[in-house]
């Protein structure tokens, strides 16, 4: 026969059991709340720091590009590519047609102030895109020049000059004194490149990398 516990002992045991249960409950709640806090704070901090980074990046560009047009890249809502608002975009670059007439050097300096260069054309597709925005009765400076007059053409961004990816009009380049390249329209050959004097004012095309935020 098991001897019955004294009421005092029973109460003591119950109290001890309850204490253990409540302790476990409190610890569990604490653990859960820690887990919840961690799970919500980490992404929040991540998003916050990404936003801060974006804002500082935008501030960088704001001095010469007060307004950007951005599009979502792929399916990820966090990746955006932007071009300054009046610029057009193609692949990974932004383009701006400058209608002011200036010398080649001044045109390049103007592009540079906007964080860009005179346009470097790398493919036929790129040229086909660019010409959609050009006027047939105008000429536009490219970022291509031969300052030494020795037919050592060079792109402003140091991209190697590849004779196989050039779109000179037939018979061009044809003059050692004409050390800067333009793109213009000739009824016989459509759009192509021509060498002209660098100091003669022309319109121009600026190109910059897209801004990723």
């Amino acid at each position: 026969m098991v001897p019955e516990e004294e009421p005092q002992d029973r109460e003591k045991g119950l109290w001890w059991f309850q204490l253990k249960v409540w302790s476990m409950a409190v610890v569990s709640i604490l653990l859960l709340s820690v887990c919840f806090t961690v799970s919500s704070v980490v992404p929040h901090n991540f998003m916050y720091s990404k936003t801060v980074k974006r804002l500082s990046k935008l501030r960088e560009y704001q001095q010469y590009h007060p307004s950007l047009t951005c599009v979502m890249e792929g399916k990820d809502i966090e990746d955006w590519s932007c071009c300054p608002t009046p610029w057009t975009s193609f692949q990974s670059s932004c383009y701006f047609i400058s209608t002011g007439m200036q010398s080649w050097t001044k045109s390049q300096k103007n592009c540079s102030v906007m964080g860009a260069d005179l346009v470097v054309i790398n493919t036929r597709e790129e040229q086909d895109f660019i010409i959609q925005n050009l006027k047939r009765n105008s000429s536009y400076f490219l970022g291509l020049s031969d300052p030494g007059g020795r037919r050592h053409w060079q792109w402003v961004d140091q991209t190697p000059y590849n004779e196989n990816v050039t779109f000179w009009h037939s018979g061009e380049p044809n003059n050692l004194d004409e050390r800067c390249a333009i793109i213009n329209f000739r009824s016989s050959e459509e759009w192509g490149w021509n060498d002209i004097h660098c100091h003669v004012p022309q319109k121009s095309i600026c190109k910059m990398k897209k801004i990723y935020i």
């Epitope: 010398s103 050097t105 300052p147 003059n175 004194d177 004097h197 100091h199 003669v200 004012p201």
Partner: antibody, heavy 121, light 111 residues
Framework: EVQLVESGGGLVKPGGSLRLSCAAS????????MSWVRQAPGKGLEWVAT????????YYPDSVKGRFTISRDNAKNSLYLQMNSLRAEDTAVYYC??????????????WGQGTTVTVSS | DIVLTQSPASLAVSPGQRATITCRAS??????????MHWYQQKPGQPPKLLIY???NLESGVPARFSGSGSETDFTLTINPVEAEDTANYYC?????????FGGGTKVEIK
Amino acid sequence: EVQLVESGGGLVKPGGSLRLSCAASGFTFSSYGMSWVRQAPGKGLEWVATISSGDSYTYYPDSVKGRFTISRDNAKNSLYLQMNSLRAEDTAVYYCARQLYYSYGYYFDYWGQGTTVTVSS
Amino acid sequence: DIVLTQSPASLAVSPGQRATITCRASESVSFHGTHLMHWYQQKPGQPPKLLIYAASNLESGVPARFSGSGSETDFTLTINPVEAEDTANYYCQQSIEDPPTFGGGTKVEIK
């Protein structure tokens, strides 16, 4: 030896015309851009017109645009300046100058002796 | 148009002394280390003669007492030592863009 010899200057009435010539020798004329630069009595130098070596481009300041025409005859090694609707302020010594390109610009490395144009009634 | 301002308008120098003429452009005439500013000498009754091209290059046949320096908007022609035959008007000219423009000239007289 490079030589540039201007001719054709003289006295002309306002509204009249004159054609200046510049005979070049001692260099391959067809390979160089050429310019006309003028100097009014007691004044500084003022560029008037430029023609590229291949005859593809001509440039003028606003002060003469539409009135003056620069041309060249590479077969004759000659440069010309046709001046129409002449005004008193066109009175000057007119120099023919050869352009030598350097990097993105150029300078005038040889000058003729000049020919005097006087516009007066 | 790029305006070139020369100073002084005139100066008188003793033989053997140094003459310094400055030319200030209304905007930069330099690009990637090339300075498209040139200097000419014009003696009375004669056409201009090229002295210095691209800011500091001495034209062949020009005496070494002539030198040029400067970049961007500020350029200097120095004659050292000055000789009697250097009495003339001196002009700067830019060619980085059309129209090519000349400074107003500096008249150098030898005392």
